[in-house]
């Protein structure tokens, strides 16, 4: 019950996470413009993965995507691959856990195959929310170092006179969203590893044990039951006890320019 | 057709209290911002105050700051401005606009006198 | 707040002229996210309300004859037009619409000699 419960919970946060994951990346809110200059702005910029936008106080709201591919910097291009890398695992992962699940019955599916298609889920929902994690954290990172590298040049202008306000960008909505949706998809990962330890058979060796029954005496030797008799080979409820999550390589993240607009 | 009817004017006492209303017809008023201008005899127009289609953004020129609010009954596709604390400098003509693309007003009612006065 | 600063503040010119008025700011109007100049032009004839001309100091509004040409970017600003008619004699305000408040400048009179 416990396992089933564990899994279950583990679906259904993944499950969360992974439109998490979409969400963010299909946001315009990764960057937005930092207002502590000028807080009345009229005309409020922010920026996604795909398009940026101004919304006027009007109510008028342009968006233009970056319609080049090879014009965009390559962090952001970077940051891209990552989330999609993290939304195709996670949608496969979604897909095989949905066969996984312990409450749905298909055929004559054993328990050790669910067990490892949980194990293939739970593998597949931690790589997914590592890879929007990744994603959003290298994002951030390009955002601060522009940050500070356009608060060293701030004001520009003729002898002062004229002041040119270069805009700043801080994090955007998106940017928390893709956090969280990837720390879920990690955790919905997690234990749908933990529960794949619950699901699989064991097979435990046995010391020897002499039975004096009437008649005759029967010898069971270690090696497991397949050839005992009365026993048989059933396999359900016993646990097995794998590996469980893998480690995947660190991504290394390094300062960009982010001025793609 | 647009139309912006501005009312509420009239002469008041420095200190004194006054609230303008703008009758809007001819757009659906609740998908547009608004702004009330007002123009000092023989000078140039001054934006005073703006609040957006949904009355969640409002702001006002420094010198009208705690002392003038404005606010909106999309309902009764009418805009306010309540006035207090009154001076001689307040005294204009008052027109109310409607706010569109571009941060601009594009259409601007006959305005109402406001005379503040002893 | 930004500062509008017109120039001259008057014009007498003659029917048929071409004219030209500057409109500077005290800062940029430029916004970059979508490269727009945040600068709105309005004529103002007397016992008459303001009139939108031109706004993202370029742009036409509607119903605007195409002799009204807007020009400029940053911080300088030009309002051109190219023959002026009688019906043209009014105040014309330059406006910033990049940031409150929204700060208009002193006006250029056109005036016929």
């Known amino acids: 019950m416990a396992v089933t419960a564990c899994q279950g919970l583990g679906f259904v946060v993944s499950l969360i996470g992974i439109a998490g994951i979409i969400a963010a990346t299909c946001m315009d809110q990764w960057s937005t413009q930092d207002l502590y200059n000028n807080p009345v702005t009229a005309v409020f910029n922010y920026q996604g993965l795909w398009r940026s936008c101004v919304r006027e106080s009007s109510g008028f709201t342009e968006c233009r995507g970056y319609f080049t591919l090879l014009g965009l910097p390559a962090m952001l291009q970077a940051v891209r691959a990552l989330m999609i890398v993290g939304i195709v695992l996670g949608a496969i992962g979604l897909l095989v856990s949905i066969f996984a699940l312990k409450c749905i019955r298909i055929g004559s599916m054993e328990d050790s195959a669910k067990a490892n298609m949980t194990l293939t889920s739970g593998i597949m929902f931690i790589v997914s929310g590592l890879c929007a994690i990744a994603g959003v954290s290298v994002f951030a990172n390009m955002l601060v170092t522009n940050f500070w590298m356009s608060t060293a040049n701030m004001y520009t202008g003729m002898g002062g006179m004229v002041q040119t306000v270069q805009t700043r960008y801080t994090f955007g909505a998106a940017l928390f969203v893709g956090w969280v949706a990837g720390g879920l998809t990690l955790i919905g990962g997690v234990m749908m590893c933990i529960a794949c330890r619950g699901l699989a058979p064991e097979e435990t060796n046995y010391k020897a044990v002499s039975y004096h029954a009437s008649g005759h005496s029967v010898a069971y030797k270690p090696g497991g039951f397949k050839a005992s008799t009365g026993f048989g080979s059933n396999t359900k409820n016993k646990k097995i006890y794998d590996g469980g999550a893998r480690t995947e390589d660190e991504v290394q993240s390094y300062p960009s320019k982010h001025d793609y607009v | 057709e647009v139309m912006l009817v501005e009312s509420g004017g009239g002469l008041v006492q420095p200190g004194g209290s006054r609230k303008l209303s703008c009758a809007a017809s001819g757009f659906t008023f609740s998908d547009y911002g608004m702004a009330w201008v007002r123009q000092a005899p023989g000078k140039g127009p001054e934006w005073v105050a703006f609040i957006n289609n949904l009355a969640y953004s409002i702001y006002y020129v420094d010198t009208v700051t705690g002392r003038f609010t404005i606010s909106r009954e999309n309902a009764k596709d009418t805009l306010y401005l309540e006035m207090s604390s009154l001076r001689s400098e307040d005294t204009a003509l008052y027109y109310c606009?409607?706010?569109?693309?571009?941060?601009?007003?594009?259409?601007w009612g006959q305005g109402t006198s406001v005379t503040v006065s002893s | 707040d930004i500062v509008m600063t017109q120039s001259p503040s008057s014009l007498t010119v003659t029917a048929g002229e071409k004219v030209t008025m500057t409109c500077k700011s005290s800062q940029s109007l430029l916004n970059g996210g979508n490269q727009k100049n945040y600068l709105t032009w309005y004529q103002q004839k007397p016992g008459q309300p303001p009139k939108l001309l031109i706004y993202?100091?370029?742009t036409r509004e509607s119903g605007v004859p195409d002799r009204f040409t807007g020009s400029g970017s940053g911080t300088d600003f030009t309002l051109t037009i190219t023959s002026v008619q009688a019906e043209d004699l009014a105040v014309y305000y330059c406006q910033n619409s990049y940031s409150y408040p929204l700060t208009f400048g002193s006006g250029t009179k056109l005036e016929l000699k």
């Open positions: 993202w100091s370029s």
């Open positions: 606009a409607r706010f569109t693309t571009g941060n601009v007003m594009d259409y």
